[in-house]
């Protein structure tokens, strides 16, 4: 996934004392957080695999990359990083591997240039749905976003709330309309079995989208169309069986787009003529020369570029009268 | 905001070649696609072609193929255009833009063809 | 390949003025123009996308419209650092293709 990186600077720790103890007072410019280190010339704080269990409140001003990976925060409350002065320059925020399962509306609240948060491998049972936009109105401001991190945040199953995982997850990219800028969406290996359908046509602004390792059987009421300027889909190691017309002319009519299907269960038979016939046309597909047949068990690792409609039959349906128990 | 740095103006003989350089930085949100674009003195734009820097995958112009050779180091963030068989007609300013809509554009490379 | 035409190559305009600039493609190209604004000393940037979508960090003053093969790029309130030439593009089918520049003057 990609996070903040800093260049390699001189970093500063500070005497380590508890975090309790650290003032509420605004920090000295130099200042730098029990249990993190500090570049000013890198503009860069890292308090990593420290067992935080909330965020530093003497974070410096100057911080532009925060990287609090590895720690036990549990719950990001609304207005975590509000301070005053704020930090107005923090860009790229990486919370990955830090335990957080609650992540409150406003939780990002004054920070006027984030544009990169990673909140990978945390075991999200609950995401506000106002986490990015920070208000229930219709409308909100617009966030800074631009890239945002998902990859691995669906929970252990006994944890879930009794509701969708993927629903909750869409209600925090759309509330508010306030990712409407976001160009990078990442949110591989989260479970996911679909798509709701309203996700792509608001995130209007989307160049990378990776659904990568999840657990995606159809694309059927899914519509790119909206995604004018997308870049890049990353599809890999899911379990779609055949993409159908009305998305290979939507994928086809994106000028811009790369495609990346490896490791699909395709299932290849009279209903992948079409798929097969616009893969040996379509140069969107990155190595589809890799694509293989998973079912039936005649066609498994048959090259799907290799097969013609002769190959892609469906087995009659009999008649129930010669149906036999 | 994406900065794109070409190298510096080149000075070639008739029938060489020249590798002008494009090295992204200054942003984390750059896109995966590289296009270069030609402009004679005094004229309009031509596109070139472009290559999606994460696989290598090209798309060229037709008038520009065995002319024009993209590449990329994906690990430097840095893209390549070599130039071949060069003729007076090729003496122009090539621009690398990133982006599918070419959304940021290097300050241009001068290449002049001279005996 | 698609043919971009820009039927004014010059336009004398006053500080102040709105000044609207013009874009013809040989085929529908489905809304897929952008526009480019180079500077005399030949810095390119681009102003608008998709037909209409503002560029990060592009003044509210240029604005673009059109459909089908017609566009345009309008500039609402001419100011003396918008002296430049401008180029619209498709990239809607490869190879991408530019209109031959519209250069824009202050009288």
């Known amino acids: 996934s990609s996070s903040p990186t800093s260049s390699a600077s001189s970093f500063s720790s500070s005497a380590p004392f508890l975090a309790s103890a650290v003032s509420a007072q605004p920090p000295l410019p130099d200042q730098c957080p029990a249990l993190c280190e500090c570049s000013e010339a890198a503009r860069t704080v890292k308090c990593v695999n420290r067992n935080l269990t909330e965020v530093p409140t003497d974070l410096p001003a100057y911080v532009r990359n925060l990287f609090l990976t590895g720690n036990q925060l549990a719950v990001l409350p609304a207005g975590a990083f509000a301070r005053r002065p704020p930090l107005a320059e923090l860009a790229a925020l990486n919370l990955s591997g830090s335990r957080l399962d609650e992540v409150r509306a406003g939780a990002f609240e004054h920070l006027p240039s984030l544009r990169q948060l990673d909140l990978s491998h945390n075991p999200l049972a609950d995401l506000s749905p106002f986490a990015f936009s920070g208000s229930n109105a219709s409308v909100s401001a617009p966030s800074p976003l631009v890239e945002l991190i998902l990859n691995h945040i669906v929970p252990p199953e006994d944890e879930r709330q009794n509701r969708s995982f993927e629903g909750m997850v869409v209600a925090a990219l759309l509330a508010g309309r306030a990712l409407q800028g976001l160009r990078r969406l990442e949110l591989a290996s989260n479970h996911f079995l679909y798509l709701p359908r309203d996700v792509l046509a608001q995130l209007p602004s989307l160049r990378h989208l990776d659904l990568s390792n999840n657990s995606l059987v159809s694309l059927t009421y899914v519509s790119f169309r909206n995604l004018t300027h997308l870049e890049s889909l990353h599809l890999e190691d899911n379990a779609l069986k055949v993409l159908h017309n009305g998305t290979l002319a939507e994928l086809q009519g994106l000028p811009h787009i790369r495609v990346f299907l490896d490791n699909n269960p395709w299932v290849c038979d009279c209903h992948m003529a079409d798929m097969v016939t616009w893969l040996k046309e379509t140069e969107v597909v990155q190595g589809k020369d890799r694509l293989t047949c998973a079912y039936p068990e005649k066609m498994r690792n048959r090259v799907l570029l290799e097969l013609n409609s002769a190959d892609l039959d469906c087995d009659p349906i009999l008649p129930p009268s010669l149906q036999t128990s | 905001e994406v900065q794109l740095q070409q190298s510096g103006p080149e000075l070639v003989k008739p029938g060489a070649s020249v590798k002008i350089s494009c090295k992204a930085s200054g942003y984390a949100f750059s896109s995966s696609w590289m296009n270069w674009v030609k402009q004679r003195p005094g004229k309009g734009l031509e596109w070139i072609g472009r290559?999606?820097?994460?696989?290598?995958?090209?798309n060229y112009n037709g008038k520009f193929k065995g002319k024009a050779t993209l590449t990329a180091d994906k690990s430097s963030t840095t893209a390549y255009m070599q130039l071949t068989s060069l003729t007076s007609e090729d003496s122009a300013v090539y621009f690398c833009?990133?982006?599918?809509?070419?959304?940021?554009w290097g300050q241009g490379t001068s290449v002049t063809v001279s005996s | 390949d698609i043919q971009m035409t820009q039927s004014t190559s010059s336009l004398s305009a006053s500080l102040g003025d709105r000044v609207t600039i013009s874009c013809r493609a040989s085929?529908?190209?489905?809304?897929?123009l952008n526009w480019y604004q180079q500077k005399p000393d030949g810095t390119v940037k681009l102003l608008i996308y998709?037909?209409?979508r503002l560029h990060s960090g592009v003044p509210s003053r240029f604005s673009g419209s059109g459909s089908g093969t017609d566009y345009s790029l309008t500039i609402s309130n001419l100011e003396q650092e918008d002296i430049a030439t401008y180029f619209c593009q498709q990239d809607n089918t490869l190879p991408w293709t530019f209109g031959g520049g519209t250069k824009l003057e202050i009288k």
């Open positions: 998709y037909t209409s």
């Open positions: 085929q529908d190209i489905s809304n897929y």
């Open positions: 833009a990133n982006g599918g809509a070419m959304d940021y």
């Open positions: 290559i999606y820097r994460e696989d290598g995958h090209t």
